[in-house]
Interface confidence: low
């Protein structure tokens, strides 16, 4: 089979027939050097998954539950292309599983025990697997058989397709539990009718069900959604209040050598020629031989899944948790009102050493997880492998887009009630050598630049945002002659000045010597023309305050700031000569860990914060010899956010807008993946 062949896996005679037709029609429209289709027939989806893993086939389209199976070892498949529904302009690749209740019913998600429940059907995603998976650890023991545990949890249910003889409580609200539309409470609309009629207290459906059944907004306003954080929201706020976000139908391939680009090329060309309303003789999204063959008949087209997205990220933390609970049936030993250890994400070797020291000193309250880049850390927090880390504002933005929330802010100024008063922020500055007297903000083109890292606030988002407004393109590697911006593409001119050795060159972690505030300033000292850092960086690394050989003899007076009006000022005049005010670094976590991270970190800073006077013999949370490990070294305390508890509110409208503008220039594969899940 030539290399440009995609071997599609079919699971029935009808699918195999459609696959052959797909193959023949593609041959007629695609040049001979383009992608082609071959068909492989297997008995089931699980057999297809195994065949792809074994390199006997390349692709198959799966429902969300099977995407989870495909991801599990030893299969290790990943999503590569998503079907979308609705219009090309507003493509829907996911639906939201929600818990709908009547407005005046007055209970929350953690108070469902003893209520009456309406389900779309036993074993169905939104109506059963997701809600029951998420409630699994609240079900009374023994939790097997599952139907019995559910029957004992709710005071009565309608769960179509359940066995009414063995589990009569599951059919209490719909006698007989009929498994078709003959049962008025079957399916999405049926489960909603069960709630509407007053038979049940809660209906587990998908977000569109309410809109499909109630055209009138005034009628919809009589209902609310239960959120996982034990609040309620209006039914149109399903994106912020759901049980899980579920992909509809997805093409999977091998994670390694999986031909994902070829599969996309094939399907993209296929939708051009044979998509909705394109061709009479062959249609990708319908078939005379049966329903939903190879692809869903209701699909309108395909979207490429961003390459950074593995199955865990694609399915989402809530969905994976629900399905894992159902499949594995394991629940934590700790009582639910007690906090489990917080798993801190540490970047590379240096942070891990400090984190391990913290872990030992915390006596089991902190555990450590390692990752090579900040984005890898954010991904680990998203999928539950880690719980928290402190981030620069640029990454708070990405984390926020990925569904994480800020919990505490680093404060850098000593004050009486430090923990109660989050600060307005710090200043992002452009530093130059005093000796380069002709250099101004207006003539930086062609100069050598030093950045903390791509995507960070003072080192990238603020200066590059301002620059973008001036040059109106993203080709910053053309604007500067060379530079060090850790996280850039390795062959970019913005990696040329970096000092990391081998694979560590230009890496966005401490293995790259020019990474971070101190690193960017060192880059200026040794090689560059301008460094983009925070206002405290120069004083923290001059006048003998940084004992490292490169810094120990530096004098603050030898450096100046570039002002946006084209003038220059001494370093201490940062308040009147800066690029913008930057939001302080903040600790982020998942919504479900917010309370525990807040509680444990406040305990930890009371034990190891700035009140510790001697850091030579004791562990100090906010010290690391100017390396800014885990937290910035100038942190005085971690402060409560009060009502600034979302990434937008924390960062502020102006900064969110600035980073939003730079989105056109974003090289963040994680941001691309997260905005695929939530545009």
């Amino acid at each position: 089979v030539p290399d440009k062949t995609v071997r599609w896996c079919a699971v029935s005679e009808h699918e195999a027939t459609k696959c052959q037709s797909f193959r023949d029609h593609m041959k007629s429209v695609i040049p001979s050097d383009g992608p082609s289709v071959a068909c492989v027939k297997k008995a089931s989806y699980l057999d297809c998954i195994r065949a792809i893993a074994a390199n006997e086939a390349d692709a198959v389209t799966l429902d969300a539950g099977l995407v989870y199976d495909a991801y599990l070892a030893p299969n290790n498949l990943k999503p590569v292309v998503a079907e979308f529904y609705g219009s090309k302009e507003d493509p829907q690749t996911f639906y939201y599983a929600v818990a709908v209740v009547k407005k005046d019913s007055g209970f929350q998600m953690n108070q469902l025990r003893g209520k009456k429940s309406c389900h779309t059907g036993l074993g169905r995603s939104a109506g059963w697997n997701i809600p029951i998976g998420l409630l699994y650890c609240d079900l009374p023991e023994p939790r097997k058989p599952l139907e019995k545990a559910v029957a004992n949890f709710f005071s009565g249910s309608c769960a179509p397709c359940a066995d009414g003889t063995d589990f009569p409580q599951l059919c209490q609200l719909c006698p007989g539990c009929g498994c078709s539309t003959l049962n008025q409470y079957f399916g999405y609309s049926g489960a909603f009718k069960c709630l509407k009629d007053g038979a049940g207290d809660v209906a587990f459906v998908k977000h569109s069900t309410i809109f499909e059944n109630l055209a009138n907004k005034a009628d919809r306003d009589q209902y609310e959604l239960l959120c996982l954080d034990n609040t309620r929201k209006p039914v149109d706020e399903y994106k912020d209040c759901h049980l899980a976000q579920v992909p509809s139908h997805t093409v999977v391939a091998r994670s390694m050598g999986g031909k994902e680009d070829l599969i996309w090329e094939l399907l993209n060309q296929a939708q051009e020629h044979f998509g909705k309303d394109k061709s009479k003789e062959f249609q990708l999204f319908s078939s005379p031989h049966g329903k939903d063959l190879l692809f869903k008949d209701s699909a309108h087209g395909f979207l490429k899944v961003p390459p950074r997205m593995d199955a865990k990220m694609y399915l989402g933390y809530e969905y994976v948790t629900a399905i894992r609970n159902l499949r594995e049936g394991t629940c934590p030993e700790a009582p639910t009102d007690e906090c489990k250890p917080v798993k801190w994400c540490a970047l590379s070797h240096h942070e891990r050493l400090k984190c391990d020291e913290w872990s030992v000193n915390s006596v089991g309250k902190i555990e450590c997880v390692s990752a090579e880049t900040t984005e890898d850390c954010i991904a680990k927090i998203m999928n539950g492998e880690a719980d928290a880390m402190s981030l620069d504002g640029g990454f708070v933005y990405i984390a926020g887009k990925c569904g994480l929330v800020p919990v505490l802010a680093e404060n850098y100024n000593k004050s009486d009630n430090c923990e109660d008063t989050p600060e307005a922020g710090y200043f992002a500055i452009a530093v130059v050598k005093k000796s380069a007297s002709d250099l101004t903000w207006d003539n930086l083109k062609g100069k050598k630049s030093c950045h903390t890292a791509v995507g960070r606030t003072a080192g990238w988002n603020i200066p590059m945002g301002l620059l973008y407004n001036k040059i109106n393109h993203c080709r910053f590697d053309e604007f500067f002659s060379e530079g060090c911006a850790p996280g850039s593409k390795k062959d970019s001119s913005l990696c040329k000045l970096c000092m990391g050795s081998g694979l560590n060159l230009c890496e966005p972690n401490n293995k790259e010597g020019y990474y971070g505030y101190t690193g960017a300033f060192r880059c200026l000292v040794e090689k560059g023309d301008v460094a983009f850092v925070k206002h405290q960086t120069v004083p923290q690394n001059t006048g003998g305050k940084n004992p490292d050989p490169w810094a120990k003899n530096l004098n603050e007076k030898d450096y100046e700031l570039l002002c946006l009006d084209g003038t220059r000022k001494p370093v201490e005049e940062y308040a009147n000569c800066h690029l913008a005010r930057a939001p302080n670094h903040a600790v982020v976590t998942r919504k479900d860990k917010e309370a525990c991270v807040h509680k444990i970190l406040r305990q930890q800073q009371h034990l190891f914060g700035s009140n510790v006077t001697d850091c030579s013999g004791n562990f100090c949370l906010f010290r690391s010899e100017t390396k800014d490990l885990l937290f910035r070294d100038d942190t005085v305390c971690l402060a409560k956010l009060h009502d600034r508890n979302t990434y937008e509110k924390y960062l502020g409208e102006e900064y969110v807008k600035a980073v939003g503008n730079l989105r056109k220039c974003s090289t963040s594969s994680l941001l691309e993946a997260c905005t695929f899940r939530r545009p």
Partner: antibody, heavy 120, light 113 residues
């Protein structure tokens, strides 16, 4: 599907201000993309005027910056062009358009255009 | 400001003929980092607004017939219609989006004999 519709006066006197509205249906202007104004002179020459991004950020053609602004009303899903101190040189068909995000500035949806004559 | 020069300014062809029009840029529109040419082609039929045909110099917009082909790199670009149909009677414009502000060519008017 996405549709854009321009509206505004057909005739404006010199030195007055010109205000045009673009009403977008089928897509929220805060959800993504940049939303542009372009004009076409009677001799068919096309000139890009500026855009407002979904985030609210604006960008204008340097030749018109001083007498030109683009604003929006997100509740009505509309964006606006205001051109001050018009002269007969501003007689043109004015189009609103959306860019394809990738690539930026390549307009994949256009309104049908509204013709404005500047004359006393 | 980048200037785009289109030629010819007009041409008349018979249905079924192949037609080629060119667009020259005053500076290169090729960005070395991603090897993409920042050029688009539009078709404007009489009394209608422009319609995007080609972007990145050679990528056809969804729904555009494959008789339209964009080619070229750097400063010289070509739009080819392999077999002209009567409905192709239009003015064709090139547009650069490499450098701010984006600019358009003066157009090539295609007439049918």
């Amino acid at each position: 599907s996405v549709q854009l519709q321009e509206s505004g006066p057909d005739l404006v006197k010199p030195s007055q201000s010109l205000s045009l509205t673009c009403t977008v249906t089928g897509y929220s202007i805060t959800s993504g993309y940049s939303w542009h104004w372009i004009r076409q002179f009677p001799e068919n020459k096309l000139e890009w005027l500026g855009y407002i991004h979904s985030s609210g950020a604006t960008n204008y053609s340097p030749s018109l910056k001083s007498r030109f602004s683009i604003t929006r009303d997100t509740s009505k899903n509309q964006f606006f062009l205001q051109l001050n101190s018009v002269t007969t040189e501003d007689t043109a068909t004015y189009y609103c358009a959306r860019d394809g995000y990738s690539p930026p500035y390549a307009m994949d949806y256009w309104g049908q255009g509204t013709t404005v004559t500047v004359s006393s | 400001v980048i200037e785009l020069t289109q030629s010819p300014s007009s041409l008349a062809v018979s249905v079924g003929e192949k037609v080629t029009m060119t667009c020259k840029s005053s500076q290169s529109l090729l960005y070395s980092t991603n090897q993409k040419n920042y050029l688009a082609w539009y078709q404007q039929k009489p009394g209608q607004s422009p319609k995007l045909l080609i972007y990145w110099a050679s990528t056809r917009e969804s729904g555009v017939p494959d008789r339209f082909t964009g080619s070229g790199s750097g400063t010289d670009f070509t739009l080819t219609i392999s077999s002209v149909k009567a409905e192709d009677l239009s003015v064709y414009y090139c547009q650069q989006y490499y450098s701010y502000p984006p600019t358009f060519g003066s157009g090539t008017k295609l007439e049918i004999k």
